[in-house]
Amino acid sequence: MAVTACQGLGFVVSLIGIAGIIAATCMDQWSTQDLYNNPVTAVFNYQGLWRSCVRESSGFTECRGYFTLLGLPAMLQAVRALMIVGIVLGAIGLLVSIFALKCIRIGSMEDSAKANMTLTSGIMFIVSGLCAIAGVSVFANMLVTNFWMSTANMYTGMGGMVQTVQTRYTFGAALFVGWVAGGLTLIGGVMMCIACRGLAPEETNYKAVSYHASGHSVAYKPGGFKASTGFGSNTKNKKIYDGGARTEDEVQSYPSKHDYV
């Protein structure tokens, strides 16, 4: 029950996280105009991964896409790539985890297969979350660097007569959405990995010991010890007791009515 709950919760948390990563990637507010010195501005600038926007105080908003690929900073391209990889991995992870859910029965899928799929999706969620966190953090670092660079030469003038105020950008809402979403996806992935351990059938098959009583001589044949982790090739629930000392792995050559366990 706890395993199902952990798996289900991991799936839901990851689902929310990936939805957040998608939302953050699509959002226009990755960087917003710094309003520290001027809280009320007639023209407000903000930028996303795909386009930059200007909102005028009168209500008019205009967005323009980055219609160049080569002209964009390498860092921005890297952030785009990280976010897209995160989304793709997360989407595949979600697809895999749907089939892995314990509460959903698909044909005669065994628990070991579900455990494998749960682990796979968990790892995908972890990598997806890390990609998102990395992407957002790279962008945030880029913003911090540019912020202090623009602060250093905040005012550039012609003979000190005319002031040109340089627009500074600070963290936008998308960064926080991305960090939280990445974190949730990561947590969801960890939960899936934990659930996977509980799903794996813990098989400790103690093979029978055979005693062959033939006159005075006692033949002692020890059975092998096998503990299945659930990831082996032979993951069927084994029939441990089969009348005598025989197992499905090992058939005795000379069965006898005097065989005991």
Partner: antibody
Amino acid sequence: QVQLQESGPGLVKPSETLSLTCTVSGGSISSNYAWNWIRQPPGKGLEWIGYINYSGNTNYNPSLKSRVTISRDTSKNQFSLKLSSVTAADTAVYYCATSYYGNSFIYWGQGTLVTVSS
Amino acid sequence: DIVMTQSPDSLAVSLGERATINCKSSQSLLNSGNQKNYLTWYQQKPGQPPKLLIYWASTRESGVPDRFSGSGSGTDFTLTISSLQAEDVAVYYCQNAYSFPWTFGQGTKVEIK
């Protein structure tokens, strides 16, 4: 097309409060515009007083901020200007105007002359 | 506050001739976000409210004749009437639409010579 019409008393006594209303037709006051008040003293230039925008936020000219209040009544599709403690220097033609793209005033009312005199 | 200074204060031009009005702002009106200059031009005829001519320094408002054009960037702007018509006699104002408070130039009166 949006049409604006100012209304209010043409004569106000010094130290009293000037109250004007702008009635909007052909559009909603809740639509994505800013609704401004601008004045023009006789024979002089234009001065922006302030605005109330689509979300109800106001912004005033700092030179008049302590005396100005702009409000709106969405049910009547009107917005209003209140200017307290008026003096003869506040005598002007008062215009209401709509600003949108480029923060430019695209629609104007015909204006109403307000004289401050005892 | 951004101070807008227009020149000349008045201008007399013959019909069909070019009229040029200058406007200078004390701060740049160029927004780096969209590379647009937030300067607007208005025409005001006697007894009428101002009429929007040009916004974003060079974008003509719909319905405005193409003889009106705006140019300039940063702090220096120009309104040009390529061929003055009798109906163009008016006072022309430039406006800072970039920074609060929105401010107007003192106006330039255009007359026929």
